[in-house]
Amino acid sequence: ETDSEGQTTTGELYQRWEHYGQECQKMLETTEPPSGLACNGSFDMYACWNYTAANTTARVSCPWYLPWFRQVSAGFVFRQCGSDGQWGSWRDHTQCENPEKNGAFQDQTLILERLQIMYTVGYSLSLTTLLLALLILSLFRRLHCTRNYIHMNLFTSFMLRAAAILTRDQLLPPLGPYTGDQAPTPWNQALAACRTAQIMTQYCVGANYTWLLVEGVYLHHLLVIVGRSEKGHFRCYLLLGWGAPALFVIPWVIVRYLRENTQCWERNEVKAIWWIIRTPILITILINFLIFIRILGILVSKLRTRQMRCPDYRLRLARSTLTLVPLLGVHEVVFAPVTEEQVEGSLRFAKLAFEIFLSSFQGFLVSVLYCFINKEVQSEIRQGWRHRRLRLSLQEQRPRPHQELAPRAVPLSSACREAAVGNALPSGMLHVPGDEVLESYC
């Protein structure tokens, strides 16, 4: 398969490289080793070398898997077999280098590797902060409410996504083919483990998007569909968040196994199969974007009225908008309509960098915005800290005879302010919980 300009796609290039290596192994198995001192035949991840007599220079044609093979088909690769019958360090691949874009493949590989380093840092940081945020929301009972239960599930989905991606990267074969400085050690990882990690990654990424959708739907319900209790809906949210991804991941696994069962399923050459996963994700991105626009409209009208008593309403609107972006994954909409097949070169790397950077650090941002700098959470932590210090100081003071230490009364009111949906006001009108909801989120 080639792209519009007749250039080999990375996926096909990898398959051709793999095929070249397999052919080499077969050839070497059927070749008789020479009787005298000689260097062993081998596939060195670049070219196929036959058994070579000691103290001579081996010569093989440029490997046919190279995308520019036509231009270098007359060229050779050289390698020196030492006097001791061992391959030396001396070699020369220069006749097989891309005559047009020398080093372009190395440059691409380098960009991809830098992106991988960036998202590894992002996901690792997200994983750490999300775990801490999850612990905080779990440990403080007074923070338990539907809103925070949804946050906790979103945090979990972000953590699973990060863990799955980082695990999958460890099991994937290195980038190939290896004309640059990244010549790999042979890939011996068990394919089953790698594919399992790939399936888990797709599920966790899917779950992450559906939980972003749940956040959007829940917020939309609170602000727009007023008068209904949210308590009963939480089960539906759970089912949507963790169940919906299975509805498209399982069909993808079946079709992939039957129609495109190649390597670790990391390359998507048959685009129709990839759309099984891509379509639902694009739909969630679109729905969340529409919800975001709707919420923004509500925000604008709220902030414009005196109800909010906010003179710096533009600043407040900007802050609220930026706060909602990571929670709803709105940034995804920027490049969502642009598929990887439609873009090439710099724009493709810009798309990759934008999506990968924001996706990997999104978990970190969400945990900071909706846990660490949340006023309710901060006041709970402060209160918990005060209680702890008080207990320690009371333990130090020995109680006198007949004197009991009365436990400090803890207010029963929840620190987690659920929006007062459906509260009847004296006027008999329904109280719209917009202010409280927006306070909690924005």
């Epitope: 670049y46 691949h93 050690t185």
Partner: antibody, heavy 119, light 113 residues
Framework: QVQLQQPGAELVKPGASVKLSCRAS????????MHWVKQRPRQGLEWIGE????????NYNEKFKTKATLTVDKSSSTAYMQLSSLTSEDSAVYYC????????????WGQGTLVAVSA | DVVMTQTPLSLPVSLGDQASISCRSS???????????LHWYLQKPGQSPKLLIY???NRFSGVPDRFSGSGSGTDFTLKISRVEAADLGVYFC??????????FGGGTKLEIK
């Protein structure tokens, strides 16, 4: 990018030994031979030897066969060169170097370690 | 072992002038594959050597086109068309045709006149 990191200097007494290190990063350590080169003050460059990190096999310049021993630690992507029975003649800057992938010319060099042999 | 001899030992030049460094090998550097493995390196003061030219005349990536290499067999030349301050340092020729060992020339110091 490819980087070869070496410590700045080593001060040793005559007759003693010294083990120089060269930590590699930015590429697959085991897929490229590591070379060592000596440079005495205001003099040319001398090739000491090379080592294949994937199997530890090495080749030496006859002149340095009894002087230098090359080893690698794959887990830390580090190449080592031990110099024994040091004399003032061994006072020099020692570089680790690596070919450009698939070639036989040195495209990547460490910063060099100055070995000063002095009583 | 192949002996590499460089001349001159020191080359004083004025900025903007052309400089020419010669390198001679004790035996032909034409490999059995037909290629000639003669390379040039520049070592600036306090730095490690840097590759300039490989296989007689091929500039390494990032090397300005002021640098050019020529020659065949046993006689080779490095030319710098318009010398700049950044070009000052010691130039070494090196061969990797008959190896091991890889051998280097004694060096030519390019300095301001």
């Amino acid at each position: 990018q490819v980087q070869l990191q070496q410590p700045g200097a080593e001060l040793v007494k005559p007759g003693a030994s010294v083990k120089l290190s060269c930590r590699a990063s930015g590429y697959t350590f085991t897929s490229n031979w590591m070379h060592w080169v000596k440079q005495r003050p205001r003099q040319g460059l001398e090739w000491i030897g090379e080592i294949n990190p994937s199997n530890g096999r090495s080749n030496y310049n006859e002149k340095f066969k009894t002087k230098a021993t090359l080893t690698v630690d794959k887990s830390s992507s580090t190449a080592y060169m031990q110099l024994s029975s040091l004399t003032s003649e061994d006072s020099a800057v020692y570089y680790c170097a690596r070919f450009y992938y698939g070639t036989s010319w040195f495209a990547y060099w460490g910063q060099g370690t100055l070995v000063a042999v002095s009583a | 072992d192949v002996v590499m001899t460089q001349t001159p030992l020191s080359l004083p030049v004025s900025l903007g002038d052309q400089a020419s460094i010669s390198c001679r090998s004790s035996q032909s550097l034409v490999h059995s594959n037909g290629d000639t493995y003669l390379h040039w390196y520049l070592q600036k003061p306090g730095q490690s050597p840097k590759l300039l030219i490989y296989k007689v005349s091929n500039r390494f990536s990032g090397v300005p086109d002021r640098f050019s290499g020529s020659g065949s067999g046993t006689d080779f030349t490095l030319k710098i068309s318009r010398v700049e301050a950044a070009d000052l340092g010691v130039y070494f020729c090196s061969q990797s045709t008959h190896v091991p060992p890889f051998t280097f020339g004694g060096g030519t110091k390019l300095e301001i006149k």
